[in-house]
């Protein structure tokens, strides 16, 4: 007899066939915290920009992705130092001069305010109450971020 | 009254919450490959190094990590042109003066036999046929992964 | 406990080395970016170089480039820093200091040893 | 190089008053700034980073304001241990990290 588990195996897949939806997550893996439809990992050790964003592509996660102002407070909120930075998913793209998500979508400028230059070799790290450009090199903390509800249609095409 | 889908929501938190187990892929999303216990995904598209793993980790996937030689020849079988080179997630750390997997772990030199030089800005490819180091600005295909199974407390502690 | 402690100091005469370590202990070396701090006899202080937890970066203070060299060696908890062609005015107690973690190259000085002095004398 | 000027660079005060120390910076550091104390013979100890948030462990008599050139250091009731010397220090992201001149709190 088949486990509720497994059960739900073919349950999920018949939906995904119907809908091209892939299992989402359901809720967020122990140690993350949820907010909104994100899970989100800050990391308590330091490393480069590059590195971080290994760490959470090995976790089969992102550097986080901020979509709006409301959002980057939300996050904010959740860190406890003011002088604390973690790393995002938001670097200087030298060949598009311009700001660039690790999602392939620009800035829209009017979301974050930046202090700092915007420059080759230039990443991007939240503080308690601000938003920084740094070098890349430089070694701090990171958030990794993991979509918590299944989307539909999701079906990952190259970016 | 739930449909099966909130039901296996139910199911797999309280099967999380007893084993600390994440709610992991059942299945493999529409247009991944299954190769044993992993999903892969091989782009269409081009990218350097950098952006390849950018995308996987937008994708809440890894670069593809390579465990020994048989996993290697069963990926490299899934290549249908001998002549396509694919990223994998193994670049040269030039601190360490070695070849490194995303995940932080060192390559075994018996694992994979790799043409070319270990030296900075050095990224590893896969063929049909061969291993090869290259320029990790170089643009070419690349391959993600997700881990198909649930593992028993993946817990995701920094690296 | 949480500690730094300097030892290679002493006198040299001008032109000569020195090599000055710093032993950590009681908190997570590897995750810190580490510097050494100076300060003359009746002076102020002055920073002289820092090196980023993983050795990657590292800077100096204009006044010692080219004849001073900070290490680290993660594994030993330790700090180094080689001091060459020395001159009257390296004279000073040197400190090791600790930045608060994570504030990337904004290096705030949380932690301190109690200094080491250098003399260089004919 | 952002060059930090204290003022005064010596004060005489008594148990009980309230102290106020100011450093300006040749050009703005938004808020990077700490201020350190420091006793004869002792090390350097860190009250105030980020130019307001108060150090673990540090009374709270002690407080930190401003942002981009001009900054404070308050001290509201003078204690008989805060005699010292306090320096305040820039910590932009771009080395050299250059320290105040100083200033020398005396007893009156």
């Known amino acids: 007899q088949k486990s509720s588990i497994e059960k739900c195996s073919v349950d999920i897949q018949q939906s995904r066939n119907k809908t091209t939806e892939r299992p989402g997550l359901l809720n967020c893996p122990i140690y993350w915290q949820q907010l909104r439809e994100k899970c989100l990992l800050f990391s308590h050790t330091v490393n480069p920009w590059n590195n971080s964003l290994a760490d959470c592509s090995t976790k089969e996660s992102s550097l986080l992705l901020i979509r709006d102002k409301d959002e980057l407070i939300h996050t904010q909120n959740l860190i406890r130092d003011k002088a604390i930075l973690f790393w995002i998913g938001l670097n200087f793209s030298l060949s598009e001069k311009n700001w660039k998500w690790i999602n392939g979508s620009f800035l829209n400028s009017n979301d974050l305010e930046i202090r700092g230059d915007a420059k080759e070799n230039s990443c991007i790290s939240i503080s308690q109450t601000s938003v920084y450009s740094e070098y890349c090199s430089t070694e701090i903390r990171w958030i990794c971020q993991k979509e918590l509800t299944p989307v539909r249609n999701k079906v990952y095409p190259d970016s | 009254q739930k449909s099966s889908i909130e039901k296996c929501s139910v199911d797999i938190q309280q099967s999380r919450n007893k084993t600390t187990e994440r709610p992991g892929l059942l299945n493999c999303p529409i247009y991944w490959q299954q190769l044993r216990e992993k999903c892969l995904l091989f782009s269409h598209t081009v990218n350097p190094w950098n952006n390849s793993l950018a995308d996987c980790s937008t994708k809440e996937s890894s670069l593809l990590l390579i465990r020994d030689k048989d996993e290697l020849i069963h990926t490299q079988n899934l290549i249908r042109d001998k002549a396509i080179l694919f990223w994998i997630g193994l670049n040269f750390s030039l601190s360490e003066k070695n070849w490194k997997w995303i995940n932080g772990s060192f390559l075994n030199s018996n694992d994979l036999e790799i043409r070319g030089d270990a030296k900075e800005n050095s990224c590893i490819s896969i063929s049909q046929t061969s291993v090869y180091s290259e320029y990790c600005s170089t643009e070419i295909r690349w391959i993600c992964q997700k881990e198909l199974t649930p593992v028993r407390n993946k817990v995701y502690p920094d690296s | 406990q949480v500690q730094l402690v300097e030892s290679g100091g002493g006198l040299v005469k001008p032109g000569g080395s020195l090599r000055l370590s710093c032993a950590a202990s009681?908190?997570?070396?590897?995750?810190?970016?580490m510097s050494w701090i100076r300060q003359a006899p009746g002076k102020g202080l002055e920073w002289v170089s820092y090196?980023?937890?993983?050795?990657?970066?590292?800077y100096y203070a204009d006044s010692v480039k080219g004849r001073f060299t900070i290490s680290r060696d993660n594994a030993k908890n330790s700090l180094y820093l080689q001091m060459n062609s020395l001159r009257a005015e390296d004279t000073a107690v040197y400190y090791c200091a600790r930045s608060l973690m994570s504030t990337g190259t904004h290096l705030y000085f949380d932690l301190w040893g109690r200094g080491t002095l250098v003399t260089v004398s004919s | 190089d952002i060059q930090l000027t204290q003022s005064p660079s010596s004060v005489s005060a008594s148990v009980g008053d309230r102290v106020t120390i100011t450093c300006r910076a040749s050009?703005?550091?938004?808020?990077?700034l700490a201020w350190y104390q420091q006793k004869p013979g002792k090390a350097p100890k860190l009250l105030i980073y980020a130019a307001s948030s108060l150090q673990s462990g540090v009374p709270s008599r002690f407080s930190g304001s401003g942002s981009g050139t001009d900054f404070t250091l308050t001290i509201s009731s003078l204690q008989p241990e805060d005699f010292a010397t306090y320096y305040c220090?820039?910590?932009?992201?771009?080395?050299?990290?250059?320290f105040g001149g100083g200033t020398k709190v005396e007893i009156k």
């Open positions: 050009q703005g550091i938004s808020s990077w």
């Open positions: 090196i980023s937890p993983s050795g990657a970066t590292i």
């Open positions: 009681g908190f997570t070396f590897p995750q810190y970016y």
């Open positions: 220090q820039q910590v932009t992201s771009t080395p050299p990290y250059t």
